[in-house]
Amino acid sequence: EVEKTACPSGKKAREIDESLIFYKKWELEACVDAALLATQMDRVNAIPFTYEQLDVLKHKLDELYPQGYPESVIQHLGYLFLKMSPEDIRKWNVTSLETLKALLEVNKGHEMSPQVATLIDRFVKGRGQLDKDTLDTLTAFYPGYLCSLSPEELSSVPPSSIWAVRPQDLDTCDPRQLDVLYPKARLAFQNMNGSEYFVKIQSFLGGAPTEDLKALSQQNVSMDLATFMKLRTDAVLPLTVAEVQKLLGPHVEGLKAEERHRPVRDWILRQRQDDLDTLGLGLQGGIPNGYLVLDLSMQEALS
C-alpha cells in the first residue's frame, strides 16, 4: 500500500503523458486521478513506466473499481494486464473478442499463464460456447489450446466451430479428446465430397470408429502411416488385411516400419499369416495357418 500524501503544488496530472515517468511512486499515487487514468488507459502502454510505477497505477484502478474493471478499461490495459492476478480477472466481464485479442497480444510468444487461462475461461463461459471466431483467435495465439480442454469442455464446441481448427491445433490431443471432436467434425464436413472430406477429417480420425474406417477404405483415400498410427487400436483391430490395404493405398508398405508399434502390432496379431503374406512386406506375427480363432467375447455374450 502506498501512503496517502498530498500532491505537491503544480504536479497534479492533467493527462497521462511521458512526464509521469519522473514521478516517484507516492507522487503518482497522490497526483494521478484514477478516473483520468481509466479514461486514458490507452496511453499507458506508450509510456516506459517501471514495474513499481505500474503497481501504483494498478492500485489506483483497483480502488476505483473494487468490483472489477469495466471492459472499456480492460481493453486498453496493455502491459498492465501482466500485473493482474487470476483473482483480479475473475471479477471481470469480458464480452468483446477485440478485448480478448488485445490482452492475448500482450502475452504473445509466452506460455499460457494462469492469468491468460483465467481470462479465456471467463470469456468462453460468458459466451456460453466456444464459437468459431473465438476458437480462431485462441488457436492463433495458442495452437495447443483445444487440446488443453477437458472432454467435458470440448462438448460445448459447436460443429460449426470445427472449421476453424487446423491440423496443428490437434497435435497434443489425446484419444479421449478426439472421441469428442471427431463426431463434431464428421457433422461439420458431411457435405464435402470424398477427397476434400478426407483432407478435412484426417486430423480428427483418432476418434473414428471401425465402421467409419471401413467406409473410408472404399474411397481410395491413401491414408499415410502417421495418420494410421493415431487411430484408436480398438477401431483398427477389426479391419481386414484387404481393408487396411485399401485404406493405406500406396502407403501400405509403411506397415513394415511400424510392425512393432501399436496399433499395427496388435492388428498384425489378429490377422491370418496367409493374409499378411499377400502384402509381400515380410510382416510376421500373424495367426499361423490351420489355427482356429475363437472370439471369446462373442461366446460370453451368447452365454
Epitope: 497435435d171 498410427m229 493415431k230 502407403h251 513394415k256 516400419a257 511400424e258 508399434h261
Partner: antibody, heavy 119, light 108 residues
C-alpha cells in the same frame, strides 16, 4: 529448417545416470518417430530403439533393454533418452534421429551428444 | 539379428575413379528396407541413399545404389574430393535395425 538439437558433452561417473534431450524444430513433431543410435569406436553404429510421439509407444533393441529409457514431451517437441547404471562400455556419441512414420530410414540426425563414463 | 558386413573397411580412390562399396547381409533383406548414410569426420551421419537406389535430397547424381537379397552396393561413378567420408549401410527389414561397420573412403 529442420533441426534436432542435442545437449553438449557429458562426463559422468560409473553407476550414474544421464538424460539426453533432443529438441526438434522445423517440422510436425508427431509425424515422425524418434530413433536413437549409439556410435562408439569399438562397435560402430548401433540402433538403441525408437519412440512414437503420438502414443509414447517404445521399441528397444534387446541389447539396450534396461539400459535406455526413451520419452517425449510433445508440448516442447523434445525427445529424451535416459541411460542408467553407466559403465565405460557406454562411452560413446549418442544421436537422436527422426524417422518418418511408415519408413525405416533416418532422414535427419541430431547434433550428437558425447557421453564419457569415467571415475 | 541381421549382420551387415561392409567391404572394404578402408579404401582410397583417385579423382575421377569409379568407386564401389559393398554391403553383405547375413540373411535376405527386402530391397525397400536398405539404405546408406554418409558421415564426415566430426559431423553427424546423413541419409545418402534409401530403398536401395533412391538418392536422398541434395545427393549428387554420380552416386547410385543397387542390389537385392543379401548383396548391396553403393557406386560413385567419378570420385571427387568432397566424397571422402565414411559410408554405412543400414537395414530395417528385421528387428533390431542394424548397421554395417562402415567403409572409410579417402582421396588419393
Amino acid at each position: 529448417e529442420v533441426q534436432l538439437q542435442q545437449s553438449g558433452p557429458e562426463l559422468v561417473k560409473p553407476g550414474a545416470s544421464v538424460k539426453i534431450p533432443c529438441k526438434a524444430s522445423g517440422y510436425t513433431f508427431t509425424d515422425y518417430n524418434m530413433d536413437w543410435v549409439k556410435q562408439s569406436h569399438g562397435k560402430g553404429l548401433e540402433w538403441i530403439g525408437d519412440i512414437n510421439p503420438n502414443t509414447d509407444d517404445t521399441i528397444y533393441n534387446q541389447k539396450f533393454n534396461g539400459k535406455a529409457t526413451l520419452t517425449v514431451d510433445k508440448s516442447s517437441s523434445t525427445a529424451y533418452m535416459e541411460l542408467r547404471s553407466l559403465t565405460s562400455e557406454d562411452t560413446a556419441v549418442y544421436y537422436c534421429s527422426r524417422r518418418l512414420i511408415g519408413t525405416g530410414y533416418f532422414d535427419v540426425w541430431g547434433t550428437g551428444t558425447t557421453v564419457t563414463v569415467s571415475s | 539379428q541381421i549382420v551387415l558386413t561392409q567391404s572394404p573397411a578402408i579404401m582410397s580412390a583417385s579423382p575421377g575413379e569409379k568407386v564401389t562399396l559393398t554391403c553383405s547381409a547375413s540373411s535376405s533383406v527386402i530391397s525397400t528396407y536398405l539404405c546408406w548414410y554418409r558421415q564426415k569426420p566430426g559431423s553427424s551421419p546423413e541419409l545418402w541413399i534409401y530403398s536401395t537406389s533412391n538418392l536422398a535430397s541434395g545427393v549428387p547424381a554420380r552416386f547410385s545404389g543397387s542390389g537385392s537379397g543379401t548383396s548391396y552396393s553403393l557406386t560413385i561413378s567419378s570420385m571427387e574430393a568432397e566424397d571422402a567420408a565414411s559410408y554405412f549401410c543400414h537395414q530395417w527389414s528385421n528387428y533390431p535395425y542394424t548397421f554395417g561397420g562402415g567403409t572409410k573412403l579417402g582421396m588419393k
